[in-house]
Amino acid sequence: FNMDTRKPRVIPGSRTAFFGYTVQQHDISGNKWLVVGAPLETNGYQKTGDVYKCPVIHGNCTKLNLGRVTLSNVSERKDNMRLGLSLATNPKDNSFLACSPLWSHECGSSYYTTGMCSRVNSNFRFSKTVAPALQRCQTYMDIVIVLDGSNSIYPWVEVQHFLINILKKFYIGPGQIQVGVVQYGEDVVHEFHLNDYRSVKDVVEAASHIEQRGGTETRTAFGIEFARSEAFQKGGRKGAKKVMIVITDGESHDSPDLEKVIQQSERDNVTRYAVAVLGYYNRRGINPETFLNEIKYIASDPDDKHFFNVTDEAALKDIVDALGDRIFSLEGTNKNETSFGLEMSQTGFSSHVVEDGVLLGAVGAYDWNGAVLKETSAGKVIPLRESYLKEFPEELKNHGAYLGYTVTSVVSSRQGRVYVAGAPRFNHTGKVILFTMHNNRSLTIHQAMRGQQIGSYFGSEITSVDIDGDGVTDVLLVGAPMYFNEGRERGKVYVYELRQNLFVYNGTLKDSHSYQNARFGSSIASVRDLNQDSYNDVVVGAPLEDNHAGAIYIFHGFRGSILKTPKQRITASELATGLQYFGCSIHGQLDLNEDGLIDLAVGALGNAVILWSRPVVQINASLHFEPS
């Protein structure tokens, strides 16, 4: 209708990075920009994804290098994290959120794909990381090894081998394990502190240089107390599980201090593993009963989990695996490891800014049934798995509904702001829920809409539209882009109109009648009034139309509803040659060229396209005759 197709601004980018996957218009004190997501962008050797800022009129795009943002205190894996897969602008302060739903971090032997988002302020400066699903690793441990280095330990090289082998089993790194070593005899010394080394390689290297310090006495109580009061303090981390491993070959010369030392360790929640090396006793034919009792006393309860004894120093190698396994059984204590909560949540798969924070879709949460999390300045709200049961019953829990594939919100005059989320795989047909979130981690689900067709991906795209701009939502549009019709993936967009408290189904939007795949409804954007009739409008993308070149459809709002026949269909081929997947993302909230008209930004594979609005001239014809 009034979108100019003759002089679009086609902003080129990398196809391999999928520049254009997401687009958002951006305003910084009058300067207009396009923010473009490129979720497969490379940073160095890693395919992190990134976000570009592109000037609207002319000039080249600049990478924001958000892919370089690192989270401290986690062993992160940024490769393939898909930064820019979702973008959400906050019109209040013109900041935006760029999400990396496949951002993962190492936890023990696993990588947890919790996802994370970067908040970028209005002048394109990174301001904060938003990662509500990120939880401390179960391997967030401070381990202090307390080594008996008294004269009776022989040969020392066996102790060293044991130390190196056990260290190789530890998941050492930021947000995981830190290791410190103290050696004792008559005195106690720090061999190295908890925060001296940040990798297995470095710790092993340091351990290989520890020499036996000797001593005629074995002050085990003092060694343990030194570890508790000093070693765990120097470089120890708040909230880290404290683990102590005591290795000794004889009764202590300060055993009357053990009671108090162990009490203090208990108070500090130090889990103690104790290893009795019986070499000295066996070489001399001494009964080790008193010694073994002492080591059992040192070890945390129950003994069968925390106490080890070996025949001699050489046999230490035989307990490496068992000791490692027992320490890491602390990881998932009483936890059903076959079930995932937020570990694979992929938070930020979708995002939506609300008044008090941001909603983040987490499609992988709760065994890929999905969830919606909320991050606010006051904290985060993570609804419990049970809070979804009303609409996502237990018997379908293995289906992977992907709730949070898209998130938005609606405003009704009765209920105020209500959140909306799509679960396109629910029971194979898809579902959309409208809900409010509570700080006690529960939800109230007000309404649910279900898809009609298996595999249609109903709910993979949702947009709320305030047609008349009165602050109350009039229409909710739900996309089912894989809707199969007439032998093709045609796609469908369902229209729901707000009647009092409920959204009532009111037909579907009409697409063109071609006989190719289209995926109409892959993207749906509520845009500000394009045709200057004072009603806000809607643009729908069909990125597979025209043999994957893509097309968009413009639908006009009218009197609290939406006209279901498109007023304009714009195909990629009209705009430029070589465009592909045009319409995969759409945003239209700003006047980009200062002509007083709202312009459109549309994403394509390797391109972002700006379509300028043209003024609409209203001609009122009137006839009058003379003479009358």
Epitope: F222, H253, D254, S255, D257, E259, K260, T290, N293, Y297
Partner: antibody
Framework: EVQLVESGGGLVQPGGSLRLSCAAS????????IHWVRQAPGKGLEWVAS????????YYADSVKGRFTISADTSKNTAYLQMNSLRAEDTAVYYC?????????????WGQGTLVTVSS | DIQMTQSPSSLSASVGDRVTITCRAS??????VAWYQQKPGKAPKLLIY???SLYSGVPSRFSGSRSGTDFTLTISSLQPEDFATYYC???????????FGQGTKVEIK
């Protein structure tokens, strides 16, 4: 030769204070524990308190807890028993004794004792 | 706290007699039990440690044994210099709390 010598005993009024010393020689205080044991006239042995001079951990009998304080000065190789709020029932001969690993946690050397009399 | 109940509180015996003194612990304890001899006006002297080990310089007629919570000091052939008071002592494991028995006075018959 291992020796323990107590001093500081004497006559004191109820409610008064006294500080006993136990000077050790022939061994290092840091490698052992010192215990104070008392014996009221005509009565048996009663354990009073102990200290590890290395770690400074202390233990007390319930009858003296809060009134007596055991301490050690390793530079002087001497242990002390500070006795406050003395009562008539604290009247006894006070012995210090060595307690260590090499005697399998038995009191192998004792001082000659010092008499403390609490009387008005 | 562990109590050590010593019996008898006194006994009369003749030179050459075999004398047995028993200490019963109120609960199961380690073998860290010692026996002392004290003569009037003198400090106690260590005889037995670890329930049954003879301290150096102590005559071999003195011996100690353990049976469950019962600890026994035996003088196989009483000598004139053995007339004294004998105390058992128990060390609480892993602390330096100690407890004495009430004492057994061995007198000449």
């Amino acid at each position: 030769e291992v020796q323990l010598v107590e001093s500081g005993g004497g006559l004191v009024q109820p409610g008064g204070s006294l500080r006993l010393s136990c000077a050790a020689s022939g061994f290092n205080l840091t490698s052992s524990y010192i215990h104070w044991v008392r014996q009221a006239p005509g009565k048996g042995l009663e354990w009073v308190a102990s200290i590890s001079s290395y770690s400074s951990y202390t233990y007390y009998a319930d009858s003296v807890k809060g009134r007596f304080t055991i301490s050690a000065d390793t530079s002087k190789n001497t242990a002390y028993l500070q006795m406050n709020s003395l009562r008539a029932e604290d009247t006894a001969v006070y012995y210090c004794a060595r307690y260590w690993y090499y005697s399998a946690w038995a009191l192998d050397y004792w001082g000659q004792g010092t008499l403390v009399t609490v009387s008005s | 706290d562990i109590q050590m109940t010593q019996s008898p509180s006194s006994l009369s015996a003749s030179v050459g007699d075999r004398v047995t003194i028993t200490c019963r612990a109120s609960q199961s304890v380690s073998s860290a039990v010692a026996w002392y001899q004290q003569k009037p006006g003198k400090a106690p002297k260590l005889l037995i440690y670890s329930a049954s080990s003879l301290y150096s310089g102590v005559p071999s007629r003195f011996s100690g044994s353990r049976s469950g919570t019962d600890f026994t000091l035996t003088i196989s052939s009483l000598q004139p210099e053995d007339f004294a008071t004998y105390y058992c002592q128990q060390s609480a494991p892993y602390s330096s709390l100690i407890t004495f028995g009430q004492g057994t006075k061995v007198e000449i018959k």
